[in-house]
Interface confidence: medium
């Protein structure tokens, strides 16, 4: 049966490498049965993930999950670093893994990682049931 | 009930391509969080994890083969796809598709019967 | 890679009595997540495996309760407490906490 738990699809240790300039759409994939969750961003400093307030963001829906997206128009240099996206369901925090950015500035591009480089690790999705209260380590 | 099931050549020649499918039921790759993995065993010896699909066709491989692979899937068919390009004797094993959900608790719970091949001139 | 090495490679046991096997890591198998993914997979002569144990200590279900995963970090034990004829086999560790996934190279349990 189907889980009506908040699930927050986002890869475990996912990256990305863009450059500095374009515009890029971070996307937090969400799945929710009835009522949409409150999600945010952060970003990641030290142990700390700080929440991003004044910063663009929208939401996609689709047929069977809905997308929210952290809007980077353009990227800066300084976006470079590690996000999360975090969900208030049911007054629990669910978060999910972190997804990290490196920034390329246009300068170095030929230096930029390739992709093979990028992709570290499988995925994996990170759900919490909704009635437990989850504190990140 | 979920079924793998792995399909392909018995016999390769070396430097040949090998082309392998696995077919199964009981889960969908269009379904958010779902994937499936090669996995080979030569005879005798220890598993050796080769590629995972996922349902956003995303697709990870093991470092030590990876220009030599493909994997590719076709959701409408339930089917996955591996390709393992100049094949040697030491490639000959039985290969193995397993599903491997998202959330840890499905890597590898269901696995097909294997299918053998062998790499021969 | 993410080396596991199984010990011992060779188990005789005598039917009913208990058996143990070792599993170590080259790096400790907590993720950032908490959970540590670690499975043990049965390998009956002849067949497919068979995953028995998954996230350390979970059995699967139709996995008798007389097998047993334990362990944390790197090092990681499968128990079996009174080994049956037909748990003969191959039983391999598997990690996937670090990419690539990698087995152990597996222990042999047969019957003295």
């Known amino acids: 049966k189907e889980s009506c738990d908040v699930q927050l699809y986002i890869k475990r240790q996912s990256e990305h490498s863009i450059l500095a300039g374009d515009p890029f759409e971070l996307e937090c994939p969400v799945k929710y049965c009835a009522n949409r969750p409150h999600v945010t961003w952060c970003k990641l400093n030290g142990t700390t993930c700080v929440k991003l307030e004044d910063r663009q963001t929208s939401w996609k829906e689709e047929k069977n999950i809905s997308f929210f997206i952290l809007h980077f128009e353009p990227v800066l240099p300084n976006d470079n670093g590690s996000y999360r996206c975090s969900a208030n369901f049911q007054s629990n925090l669910i978060e999910s893994h972190s997804t990290t950015l490196y920034v390329t500035d246009v300068k170095s591009a030929s230096e930029r990682p390739s992709k093979d480089e990028m992709a570290s690790r499988p995925w994996l999705l990170y759900r919490h049931h909704h009635h437990h209260h989850h504190h990140h380590h | 009930q979920i079924t793998l099931k792995e399909s392909g050549p018995t016999l390769v020649k070396p430097t040949q391509t090998l082309t392998l499918t696995c077919t199964f039921s009981g889960f969908s790759l269009s379904t958010f969080g779902m994937g499936v993995s090669w996995i080979r065993q030569p005879p005798g010896k220890a598993l050796e994890w080769l590629a995972h699909i996922y349902w956003d066709d995303d697709k990870r491989f093991n470092p030590s083969l990876k220009s030599r692979l493909t994997i590719t899937k076709d959701t409408s068919k339930n089917q996955v796809v591996l390709t393992m390009t100049n094949m040697d004797p030491v490639d000959t094993a039985t290969y193995y598709c397993?599903?491997?959900?998202?959330?840890?608790?499905?890597?590898?719970?269901?696995w097909g019967q294997g299918t053998l091949v062998t790499v021969s001139s | 890679d993410v080396v596991m090495t199984q010990s011992p490679l060779s188990l005789p046991v005598t039917l009913g009595q208990p058996a143990s096997i070792s599993c170590k890591s080259t790096?400790?198998?907590?993720?950032?997540?908490?959970?540590?993914?670690l499975n043990w997979l049965q390998q009956r002569p002849g067949q497919s495996p068979r995953r028995l144990i998954y996230l350390v200590s979970k059995l699967d279900s139709g996995v008798p309760d007389r097998f047993s995963g334990s362990g944390s970090g790197t090092d990681f034990t499968l128990k079996i407490s009174r080994v049956e004829a037909e748990d003969v086999g191959v039983y391999y560790c598997w990690q996937g906490t670090h990419f690539p996934w990698t087995f152990g190279q597996g222990t042999k349990v047969e019957i003295k």
């Open positions: 397993a599903r491997g959900n998202w959330d840890g608790e499905t890597y590898f719970d269901y």
């Open positions: 790096q400790s198998l907590l993720d950032s997540d908490g959970k540590t993914y």
